[in-house]
Interface confidence: medium
């Protein structure tokens, strides 16, 4: 088999024509990166290499996932004689997968004379640019259209060597050099019309498997020169063995013990140590909506519940900044945890002419909606006049008090004349330090809060000179009737510390939608949760008794075992191949005949959709 089982992978570069150091340094870097490398994960960039250097170490390279750039070198030949595929996952100058430019020395005889890419039979994406290589021969004798997968692309080849020897007579006009060993192997333009990819001969039965790239030695997926998608232990496959397979006993997708991960174009049992698993791929770092976790010794990317954790430096003592202001507000975007403190001072909000800091745009305070924890203190001494609460901190759960303000305060709110309620609806703990809330002349509701539940000691509270409790009650600034006796942070059912009856997504409600309403719910404790979308709404009765698709009273579409499903399994990967089922008259999913390969409408062989397998061959699995 041409396709090997284990392959040495190395990282490519993304420097373009920029180089650092002299020619010797360039060579050493190149040698260090590509010695014994078979697959370049990225781009292969060879720039400004001298004619005296030995580049034979490049001959192990069989595949480049990005682009190849050969520019301003003066060696005579490129020893990439085993290169089979350029994948073109990245392009040079936006459209080229192979870019060869200015490989000659105008003041000497040294120059690139031959590309030597004799085994290159596939460029999966991107075009070819080979220009201004004064002595480079046999680039216009290559049938680039046979190599480039994209038929719309025109190769850009010109202004190269002029005094070139013809191809050897045995090559039929297509070659990489003058000798009989330099003939170009055509694997696409010579194929029979029946072949929808490449071929290993002209006959209709000499087509390569559709998963091959670059050609093949025979018809099987193990006969490929290289793989179009993924190489799984020598076989070219459209996908690596997936992390989940269908269990016919539990009617659920379960972890596949034989799962493999995509590492470039190779399926591997485990990712290299500096990579993490994202779904079924090895990646250098998790995407922005996921975070790295370790499960059973495996580093994986998991979707974050909401925003991914992000810790940011705060203000005040030990920080670069005395206060949140217009010069630093943008550094708090997407922060979930403040390491240290947050100070809101008049010099931050109104600006500080002495430090040449302009006034803060109050809208920007909304960046703090993502903050869930402050490890130090929260100190609010100035707040925009039109903002009547601190609802930008509505997701703040914990004030740690690891560093304290002034005489031991972890929460200090003073002299905010326009604030009428605190609005700290998620605050559940002030771990250490004292609470000081004074001289906020319009501030109500804070008398209702059971501070003892948040703070450690009653003596740690200094709450005075705010709007008198009696005045607040006269003005109707009291907790919503749906709040419990624990109090509230402000008006309405969303500001309660806890609920008298039930709560739905943080808002207190009289009751969950058990038997009526557009969306039906069940209760876990006093919290309302929606039934699974695959549950059918039961009029005047209970729709579900839990969150799963197996807790529905009735199914909205179909039932597969105990689970309500949108459609019956169609080609879902099982232990022994794809699984197909059909819905019976009572909308239960039933297995197709074992020889059906594309689904069915009933249990019999004649109910199969498309072609059924002949009786002897039984690849797909049905249950």
């Amino acid at each position: 088999s041409e396709v090997g089982n284990s392959q040495a992978v190395c990282a490519g570069t993304l420097n373009g024509l920029s180089v650092t150091g002299d020619a010797q340094h360039q060579y050493r870097t190149l040698h260090k990166m590509y010695n014994n490398c078979e697959i370049v994960m990225g781009n292969l960039e060879i720039v400004l290499i001298d004619h005296t250097q030995d580049l034979s170490f490049l001959q192990t390279i069989r595949e480049v996932t990005g682009y190849i750039l050969i520019a301003m070198n003066v060696f005579s030949t490129l020893p990439l004689r085993n290169l089979r595929v350029i994948r073109g996952t990245q392009f040079y100058e936006e459209k080229y997968a192979l870019f060869v430019l200015l490989n000659y020395n105008p003041n000497a005889t040294h120059a690139l004379r031959q590309l030597g890419l004799n085994r290159l039979t596939e460029i999966l994406a991107g075009g070819v640019y080979i220009e201004k290589n004064e002595q480079l021969c046999h680039v216009d004798t290559v049938e680039w259209r046979d190599i480039m997968r994209d038929p719309r692309l025109e190769p850009v080849v010109g202004d190269n060597g002029r005094a070139c020897a013809p191809c050897h007579e045995s090559c039929g006009g297509h070659c990489w050099g003058p000798g009989p060993e330099d003939c170009q192997q055509l694997t696409k333009t010579i194929c029979a019309p029946q072949c929808n990819g490449r071929c290993f001969g002209r006959a209709p039965n000499e087509c390569c498997h559709e998963e091959c790239a670059g050609g093949c030695t025979g018809p099987l997926q193990t006969h490929c020169f290289a793989c179009r998608h993924f190489n799984d232990s020598g076989a070219c496959v459209p996908l690596c063995p997936q992390p989940l397979i269908y269990n016919k006993l539990t009617f659920q997708l379960e972890p596949n013990p034989d799962t493999k991960y995509q590492y470039g174009s190779v399926c591997v049992r485990s990712c290299p140590h500096n990579f993490v698993v994202d779904q079924s791929s090895c990646v250098r770092a998790c995407p922005s909506n996921k975070m790295e976790v370790e499960k059973n010794g495996l580093k994986m990317c998991e979707p974050c519940a909401g925003l991914c954790p992000k810790a940011c430096e705060g203000t005040g003592a030990g920080s670069h900044y005395q206060t949140v202001d217009s010069s630093n507000i943008d550094s708090f975007v997407n922060c979930t945890k403040i390491l240290g403190n947050l100070d809101f001072l008049i010099t931050g909000l109104e600006g500080d002419p002495w430090r040449n800091i302009s006034a803060l745009d109050p809208e920007k305070l909304n960046v703090f909606r993502t903050v869930r924890e402050i490890t130090g203190y929260l100190n609010i001494q100035s707040w925009p006049k039109h903002m009547h609460n601190f609802s930008v901190f509505s997701n703040l759960e914990t004030i740690g008090g690891r560093s304290l303000y002034n005489r031991g305060f972890s929460l200090l709110i003073m002299k905010n004349d326009n604030v009428t309620s605190l609005g700290l609806r998620s605050l559940r703990e002030v771990s250490a330090g004292r609470v000081y809330i004074t001289e906020n002349r319009r501030l109500c509701y804070l008398h209702t809060v059971q501070w003892a539940a948040l703070s450690r000691r009653r003596a740690d509270l200094d709450i005075r000179n705010n709007k008198p409790r009696g005045k607040c009650q006269q003005e109707g600034k009291v907790c919503d009737p749906l709040c419990s006796a624990d109090g509230c942070w402000g008006p309405g059912p969303a500001q309660c510390l806890s609920c008298r009856h039930y709560s739905r997504r943080g808002v207190c409600v009289e009751s969950c939608s058990f038997t009526q309403g557009e969306t039906r719910e069940f209760a876990e404790g006093t919290e309302c949760f929606e039934c699974h979308p695959e549950c059918e709404r039961v009029e005047g009765g209970i729709t579900c008794n839990g969150s799963g698709a197996d807790t529905c009273t009735r199914c909205a579409h179909y039932r597969d075992g105990p689970h309500c499903v949108e459609r019956c399994p169609e080609g879902i990967l099982g232990e022994r191949g794809p699984i197909y089922k059909y819905p019976d008259s009572s909308r239960e999913c039933r297995p197709c005949h074992e020889n059906c390969t594309r689904g069915c409408t009933g249990p019999l062989l004649q109910d199969c959709l498309g072609d059924a397998l002949p009786s002897a061959r039984r690849a797909p699995t049905v249950i």
Epitope: Q322, T323, D343, L345, Q381, N406, R407, M414, E439
Partner: nanobody
Framework: EVQLVESGGGLVQAGGSLRLSCAAS????????MGWFRQGPGKDREFVAA????????DYADSVKGRFTISRDNAKNTVYLQMNSLKPEDTAVYYC??????????????????WGQGTQVTVSS
């Protein structure tokens, strides 16, 4: 920083009066409060009185309530401490202090970031 200069200290008989002044200059546009503290011989510095610069709210130590009065003149950036019915135990160096951002509660020494040099008040019996 705010620069502070005190004046008005001196020697006075018990039961007598003195008026201390403290003039602020420099970065006074963000003043929060100005206060008076004192430090008797061999004692810690202690709070005497303070006045909120924006609304004139006043705070006094229990030991001086009813005898001392703090006032301010915003136009002159000056704070005054009128001391009546002085007692020998009022003998101390009196310091003027200013609280600029970040502000703190008026009665706490930690809230003040600018201090005068101090003026000596001696009450003889």
């Amino acid at each position: 920083e705010v620069q502070l200069v005190e004046s008005g200290g001196g020697l006075v008989q018990a039961g007598g009066s003195l008026r201390l002044s403290c003039a602020a200059s420099g970065r006074t546009y963000y003043l929060n409060a100005m206060g008076w503290f004192r430090q008797g011989p061999g004692k810690d510095r202690e709070f005497v009185a303070a006045i909120d610069w924006s609304d004139g709210n006043k705070d006094y130590a229990d030991s001086v309530k009813g005898r001392f009065t703090i006032s301010r003149d915003n136009a002159k950036n000056t704070v005054y401490l009128q001391m009546n019915s002085l007692k020998p135990e009022d003998t101390a160096v009196y310091y003027c202090a200013a609280d600029t951002p970040p502000w703190g509660p008026m009665i706490y020494i930690e809230s003040y970031d600018s201090w005068g040099q101090g003026t000596q008040v001696t009450v003889s019996s």
